[in-house]
């Protein structure tokens, strides 16, 4: 407990060039009689920043009216901050003395430093797509911030990730710093609609972190499953064969039919549908003439997905004598 305390609540004040800085100072007593002055630095070489009684300080204004009775707020604002303004600022109470005022009590000081906001984080994924169950790396970069202390977090669909490495450069003193972080993410089959988020928190952002995102749809390849089936119904002397290509991503797909090893150009119809998880289904129908066919017809549905090696599924056509004899409007 003391007769008078000088309260400077902020140890560190981060300011931006060109902006206005507010330096807070309150006193707990108006006694003893005497002015409150602001200085930058300590000792005999300290620089007078503001004196309420005398001098011309064009960039400095007081937050409160110092002529108001019982005023205990001696905070000041300094406008148009430049790099030359950095340093530690002290509010100092003087008491009236004879013949001149005597320094009575100093505040603990507020260090003014230039702060710079980090740039918006940029998240980059892998150059090539990878299939589920494999691990992919994402990098996040942000630049131009000061001071050096910064926090970076990774999230996948809102869940925080722990497998990442972060570096802040340079390690020594600098006007501005950069951060780079690499996160390792295991892909799940349902990750087409997933997102990874890089979140950067810095003192200059006032509790409102910056976020960068990347869609896992850019990094994942979900290979299709194939199923070839013969439709029980016959249309005249033709049999309908279906090739169902399920759960693939991305959409890029080439489908070809082969009849006993010979590629066929004809394809009756096809449909593309999107699943809830963002993957696609492709259904292709192929009509086979059976009037002049032998019984050993082998149909192959071949799929080339996203530039990968082709996968295929074969079906040996079952054509009974009874089917061959039926008229075109009959139902088998």
């Amino acid at each position: 407990e003391e007769e008078l305390q000088m309260i400077q609540p902020e140890k560190l004040l981060l300011v931006t060039v060109g902006k206005t800085a507010t330096l807070h100072c309150t006193v707990t007593s108006l006694l003893p009689v005497g002015p409150v002055l602001w200085f930058r630095g300590v000792g005999p070489g300290r620089e007078l920043i503001y004196n309420q009684k005398e001098g011309h300080f064009p960039r400095v204004t007081t937050v409160s009216d110092l002529t108001k009775r019982n005023n205990m707020d001696f905070s000041i604002r300094i406008s148009s901050i430049t790099p030359a303004d950095v340093g530690t600022y002290y509010c100092v109470k003087f008491r009236k003395g004879s013949p001149e005022n005597v320094e009575f009590k100093s505040g603990p000081g507020t260090e003014m430093a230039l702060g710079a906001k980090p740039s918006a984080p940029v998240v980059l994924g892998p150059a090539a797509r990878t299939t589920p169950e494999h691990t992919v790396s994402f990098t996040c970069e942000s630049h131009g911030f000061s001071p050096r202390d910064i926090t970076l977090k990774w999230f996948k669909n809102g869940n925080e990730l722990s497998d990442f490495q972060t570096n802040v450069d340079p390690t020594g003193q600098s006007v501005a710093y950069s951060i780079r972080s690499t996160a390792r993410v295991v892909l799940d089959p349902w990750d087409v609609r997933s997102q990874v988020i890089c979140e950067v928190a810095h003192v200059t952002l006032q509790g409102d972190p910056l976020r960068g995102t990347a869609n896992l749809s850019e990094a994942i390849r979900v290979p299709p499953t194939l199923e070839v089936t013969q439709q029980p119904m016959r249309v005249g002397n033709q049999v309908n064969v279906t090739c169902q290509v399920r759960k693939f991503y991305p959409q890029s797909l080439q489908l070809t039919w082969s009849e006993n090893g010979n590629v066929c150009q004809r394809e009756t119809a096809s449909t593309l549908t999107e699943n809830k998880d963002g993957t696609y289904n492709w259904t292709s129908w192929f009509l086979v003439n059976i009037s002049d066919q032998r019984d050993d017809v082998v149909l192959t549905c071949q799929v080339k997905h996203d530039g990968q090696l082709a996968v295929s599924k074969r079906l040996a056509l079952e054509v009974t004598v009874h089917q061959k004899d039926q008229s075109s409007d009959a139902t088998p």
Epitope: E1, E2, E3, S29, L30, L31, P32, V33, G34, P35, Q52, K53, D65, L66, T67, K68, R69, N70, N71, R95, K96, G97, S98, V102, F104
Partner: antibody, heavy 114, light 111 residues
């Protein structure tokens, strides 16, 4: 709680030095100043001087040549010395805390007489 | 030195009435937006008790019947309503300039 207590000889011979002690409790002498004030019998109050927390002093110019205020922070004591006393220095002597004089001792009576 | 002149020198008031004491300074006691004038109550055989600081601020524990006003050179202590135990000497004091000085006192008696 805050307390101040004056002590010293009740009788001092003329031309001698009056020495009083103010023992304080409930606050620190490094954080607060202590005043000395006196009151001659049946008269008003007269400020003698103050010793601040940093041990600097300010005195009433009318008494400055004869007054010394000092302190021993470790013992929580403030001292008043008034030299070359005369009968006009007969008074109740008070010590009071700080510029606000918010706490006072009970006072000690000093008579200057041969 | 700043001379503080109190008036009246003595005052007799009935309980429930208002008592007004004035203190005039030979020069302004205002500095840095405040009036460095204080009021004390002293009863016989006791040390002064602070009532008002900085012209108008009530010390903690002091009844709201006591109030202070004024600035510059003219100050007033008001007791309203007066009670029997308010009988005492009242002093104004300035600590705007050295030497710090007290007024000559006003004796308040209860009728």
């Amino acid at each position: 709680q805050v307390q101040l207590q004056e002590s010293g000889p009740g009788l001092v011979k003329p031309s001698q030095t009056l020495s009083l002690t103010c023992t304080v409790s409930g606050f620190s002498l490094t954080g607060y100043g202590v005043n000395w004030i006196r009151q001659p019998p049946g008269k008003g109050l007269e400020w003698i001087g103050i010793i601040w927390g940093d041990a600097s002093t300010d005195y009433n110019a009318a008494l400055k040549s004869r007054v010394t205020i000092s302190k021993d922070t470790s013992k929580n004591q403030v001292f008043l010395k008034l030299s070359s006393v005369t009968a006009a220095d007969t008074a109740v002597y008070y010590c009071a805390r700080a510029g606000k004089m918010d706490y006072w001792g009970q006072g000690t009576t000093v008579t200057v007489s041969s | 030195d700043i001379v503080l002149t109190q008036s009246p020198a003595s005052l007799a008031v009935s309980p429930g009435q208002r008592a007004t004491i004035t203190c005039r300074a030979s020069e302004s006691v205002d500095s840095y937006g405040n009036s460095f004038m204080h009021w004390y109550q002293q009863k016989p055989g006791q040390p002064p008790k602070p009532l008002i600081y900085l012209a108008s601020n009530l010390e903690s524990g002091v009844p709201a019947r006591f109030s202070g006003s004024g600035s510059g050179t003219d100050f007033t202590l008001t007791i309203n309503p007066v009670e029997a135990n308010d009988a005492a000497n009242y002093y104004c004091q300035q600590n705007n300039e050295y030497p710090w000085t007290f007024g000559g006192g006003t004796k308040v008696e209860i009728k």
